[in-house]
Amino acid sequence: VPPGEDSKDVAAPHRQPLTSSERIDKQIRYILDGISALRKETCNKSNMCESSKEALAENNLNLPKMAEKDGCFQSGFNEETCLVKIITGLLEFEVYLEYLQNRFESSEEQARAVQMSTKVLIQFLQKKAKNLDAITTPDPTTNASLLTKLQAQNQWLQDMTTHLILRSFKEFLQSSLRALRQM
């Protein structure tokens, strides 16, 4: 079953197709389910989920975060600004999702599914934002060197990085989901 589709929708092509907002909502919830499965493996494998040393590793990362100025929160909500932030943030997360590949043993396919589903989500959102100003795409060279740097970390830092990426991505998607429901 492809991400964001009901098995019954696939089995019965005559059914009403999903609208743009339904596809986006469903896609985000599908990715969140995938993140939950990955977090389960991460937390079972190491004690990172209870660690108090997160700040140490967080200094090395520049994970996308929602801020007041992005217009995605209840106070100061701005539909256009927020939509741009969601798309930009997801594009910035792509390098971190690439890093997650090969970081899982039993959930390797789940990690790939999260990555591919995020690409699809970005496409859905870009269609929704087609009338908005151009959205800046991360520089591939910068991403490549960041990926190399992350992969060169010691085991403990790699485990911590994995945990932080999953946690931040989950928080980002949850904020996005709430915001998109006012759009």
């Epitope: 999903l18 909502d25 909500f77 989901l177 429901r181 006012q182």
Partner: antibody, heavy 120, light 111 residues
Framework: EVQLVESGGGLVQPGGSLRLSCAAS????????MSWVRQAPGKGLEWVSR????????YYADSVKGRFTISRDNAKNTLYLQMNSLKPEDTAVYYC?????????????WGQGTQVTVSS | QSVLTQPPSVSGSPGKTVTISCAGT?????????VSWYQQLPGMAPKLLIY???KRASGIADRFSGSKFANTASLTISGLQSEDEADYYC??????????FGGGTKLTVLG
């Protein structure tokens, strides 16, 4: 305190037009998707239309599509419903409603309503 | 007007429990957890009680609870009080970026 005050209702002949307004106060109007819901005399509630927080997206019930237009002016904290080609079955109390934050299609605040009567 | 199916009326004695059902289809009630419930006192605007199937709105007593199974949602009111006498409406997101309401249920508190 959240307040939604509707106005613009009245008696109109079939085929006529009306423009309803809803003045919002007590919350950041531009942060919320808004809707119109109506209630025919002695009948249940019927969802009419929805507009996104910034006014980019609009949605309509099939019964009003092509005849009604929802809009908003965030600078004036006001929601509108332009109703054209009115029919007797559009007779109802029209409520201005706010969508709960971050929730899929739940209405957390309602105005007191404005009566629209379509009759010859 | 496409509506969800609710019983026209229910009744119960003070202190008792009543349940109001709301039957829909896989395109509305059965699609996601997007059911809400509203109370409308005579001559008043509706008031949100429950959203997302089972979450209570701010300031709503825990006597009110919601649930869902397949294409049918339910509102349960326990410890019935005379002030609960009102019309109750369910609502749901409906596939195609629409919302749909139930026909309403009149709750009578006996005695």
């Amino acid at each position: 305190e959240v307040q939604l005050v509707e106005s613009g209702g009245g008696l109109v002949q079939p085929g006529g037009s009306l423009r309803l307004s809803c003045a919002a106060s007590g919350f950041t109007f531009s942060s919320y998707a808004m809707s119109w819901v109506r209630q025919a005399p002695g009948k249940g509630l019927e969802w009419v239309s929805r507009i996104s927080s910034g006014g980019i997206s609009t949605y309509y019930a099939d019964s009003v599509k092509g005849r009604f237009t929802i809009s908003r002016d965030n600078a004036k904290n006001t929601l509108y419903l332009q109703m054209n080609s009115l029919k007797p079955e559009d007779t109802a109390v029209y409520y201005c409603v706010r969508y709960a934050w971050g929730v899929q299609w739940a209405f957390d605040f309602w105005g007191q309503g404005t009566q629209v009567t379509v009759s010859s | 007007q496409s509506v969800l199916t609710q019983p026209p009326s229910v009744s119960g004695s003070p202190g008792k429990t009543v349940t109001i059902s709301c039957a829909g289809t896989s395109s509305d009630v059965g699609y996601g957890n997007y059911v809400s419930w509203y109370q409308q006192l005579p001559g008043m605007a509706p008031k949100l009680l429950i959203y997302d199937v089972n979450k209570r709105a701010s300031g709503i007593a825990d006597r009110f609870s919601g649930s869902k199974f397949a294409n049918t949602a339910s509102l349960t009111i326990s410890g019935l009080q005379s002030e609960d006498e009102a019309d109750y409406y369910c609502a749901s997101y409906k596939r195609g970026d629409n919302a749909v309401f139930g026909g309403g249920t009149k709750l009578t508190v006996l005695g």
